[in-house]
Interface confidence: low
Amino acid sequence: QPPPPPDATCHQVRSFFQRLQPGLKWVPETPVPGSDLQVCLPKGPTCCSRKMEEKYQLTARLNMEQLLQSASMELKFLIIQNAAVFQEAFEIVVRHAKNYTNAMFKNNYPSLTPQAFEFVGEFFTDVSLYILGSDINVDDMVNELFDSLFPVIYTQMMNPGLPESVLDINECLRGARRDLKVFGSFPKLIMTQVSKSLQVTRIFLQALNLGIEVINTTDHLKFSKDCGRMLTRMWYCSYCQGLMMVKPCGGYCNVVMQGCMAGVVEIDKYWREYILSLEELVNGMYRIYDMENVLLGLFSTIHDSIQYVQKNGGKLTTTIGKLCAHSQQRQYR
Amino acid sequence: SAYYPEDLFIDKKILKVAHVEHEETLSSRRRELIQKLKSFINFYSALPGYICSHSPVAENDTLCWNGQELVERYSQKAARNGMKNQFNLHELKMKGPEPVVSQIIDKLKHINQLLRTMSVPKGKVLDKSLDEEGLESGDCGDDEDECIGSSGDGMVKVKNQLRFLAELAYDLDVDDAPGNKQHGNQKDNEITTSHSVGNMP
């Protein structure tokens, strides 16, 4: 079946092109040879000009970008929404964990509260910062918490007769805390639990944020001129022949799209791996790999660690008395 | 797990306290996210097809455009790229991905490596290494003093996810919430930890 004859006057082509580029007189009145065309190479007379071709290429690339954005809209929203939800959720968990820990001190060790609140606050601030990607060492955070707590426990509970704590004895007590393992293996336990759960939480958030970056990158891809030419030929060159209602062949479209998206499709392998690796991570996020579980139970372990100090109070006071005697003498003078 | 009013009291006539169908928590939210993400696992390989199906393509028409001429939809010419002399599709592919795409691929490789190293190997969470970390209620080592389960007034079963804390309380002039807060627990993966704080119900 031969193709229908082209529009003898280019009238239809003009009215369509006016919608793309209002007010411009780039459409020939009647079909022309079109020898200057580079994309829509005519087999006979054409209703397209070089300027029109350029406009079609621009429009085709814009269409492609919009199609790509609409393709990724649902996925993009899913990851953006979840990244925000989880970030806020983790902040809420940290806030509650801090409040539980403070409540434990207020309930059980009121004499420690003012300073304990301060140290607990600093610890959980660091926890939040770590989750958000800060370059903080979890072991240092835990050590700092126990280093800070011990002088207060010693001067307020174990040896309340001492004068107001002076930096000298505090420094000695901080050192003794580690040397004598005054909290037993609790600091090590907390380090293990907190570092494992926070590492996983942090990488989970990082992964979600990278997911957003991946979608954003492909969302805003600028397609090459070659791709623009292929798209133009597929979507608009038929208009030059006055064939306004005809659509591209399905197989042809697939070939063109694969050509245009050859680079993007290379992401596929790594994207699949990303989702499967994220699934594996999520499946393992329980017990000590679940920050909600670990942080909300921290008050209990800290409470147990202080009880451990109290239980060994007698032995410790004697040992520390000798170990920090020099600092104490300087205090009493 | 995490409970909320819509679950607890869905039916105003019958108090559905015993069987809550959606006991959702952060972990179930994570799993839900993964399930949704998995439906996008072929996203990039399916893009060309998606875009063709969302742009004008001849479906029911007898004739279609192959870039050069009008042809019958099922003819060999229909799939062929018209005007091959213009430029070659194969050449276009050979150029390789744009720099931004290469960059994002590198970032994906990096995060995938991190995710794999961070993932808990199957069975790891239940193995002996956790006992050594003091999490299980079995052996506590030679020094009973250091056994986590040995201090406190009573042992309470604590289930994974949100633990119920009771009466931690009294108004705190700290941050934004009183410490006297309660939170849920999940049925599976039980571990035992002692809680000697407050009155556990």
């Epitope: 806020e88 959720a89 809420i92 806030r95 509650h96 | 797990s1 995490a2 409970y3 909320y4 009013p5 819509e6 607890l8 009291f9 105003k12 019958i14 108090l15 306290v17 015993a18 069987h19 809550v20 959606h22 959702e24 928590t25 952060l26 179930s28 939210r29 949100l162 119920f164 009771a166 934004d176 919430a177 009183p178 006297n180 807060k181 309660q182 939170h183 849920g184 627990n185 009155n199 119900p201």
Partner: antibody, heavy 120, light 105 residues
Framework: EVQLVQSGAEVKKPGASVKVSCKAS????????ISWVRQAPGQGLEWMGW????????NYAQKLQGRVTMTTDTSTSTAYMELRSLRSDDTAVYYC??????????????????WGQGTT | DVVMTQSPLSLPVTPGEPASISCRSS???????????LDWYLQKPGQSPQLLIY???NRASGVPDRFSGSGSGTDFTLKISRVEAEDVGVYYC??????FGQGTK
Amino acid sequence: EVQLVQSGAEVKKPGASVKVSCKASGYTFTSYGISWVRQAPGQGLEWMGWISAYNGNTNYAQKLQGRVTMTTDTSTSTAYMELRSLRSDDTAVYYCARDGLSSSWFYYYYGMDVWGQGTT
Amino acid sequence: DVVMTQSPLSLPVTPGEPASISCRSSQSLLHSNGYNYLDWYLQKPGQSPQLLIYLGSNRASGVPDRFSGSGSGTDFTLKISRVEAEDVGVYYCMQALQTFGQGTK
């Protein structure tokens, strides 16, 4: 100090609508929910409904379904309760109270631990 | 709807004496998580209500330890070990986030 401050007394004719506000301060508004409770003169307390300040989820008492709408404005840490088609038996003191936080995956139940001063 | 029934409706008590209020629900308030979704509130004359006990037996922040809650399923009790003059008011039990009892004065 954690507190909820409600809008002033209102006088309305039958059939009209009323919108009571409840401004929260001293805590993170979106970490909790808000319940509304009313008390007719000389009567007991009646729970009207609940809204999550985190995501706007609501749960209304069946008796008021269709007449009551609860909303929040997180930018001003304010909760609102609107009651439409007022009847004479809606005459009451209306209280807002801080309640548990909820979204579809995260819920801590605290009881209604902080109350507003009431709006007549 | 679940019906909450309190008894007695009025309870005259001398300061220093113990007091006990009972609350019965028409259906079990015991959730599968092991907690009873029942709260106790006190409304002092001319004041807003205040939370005393939540989830059956948990004393709220700042509530004196002379107040205690007990019970499970459908039967609950609020006890005051030694009543003080400031404890005067109306006590309400509440099925969490749903229905109040009629109050005990």
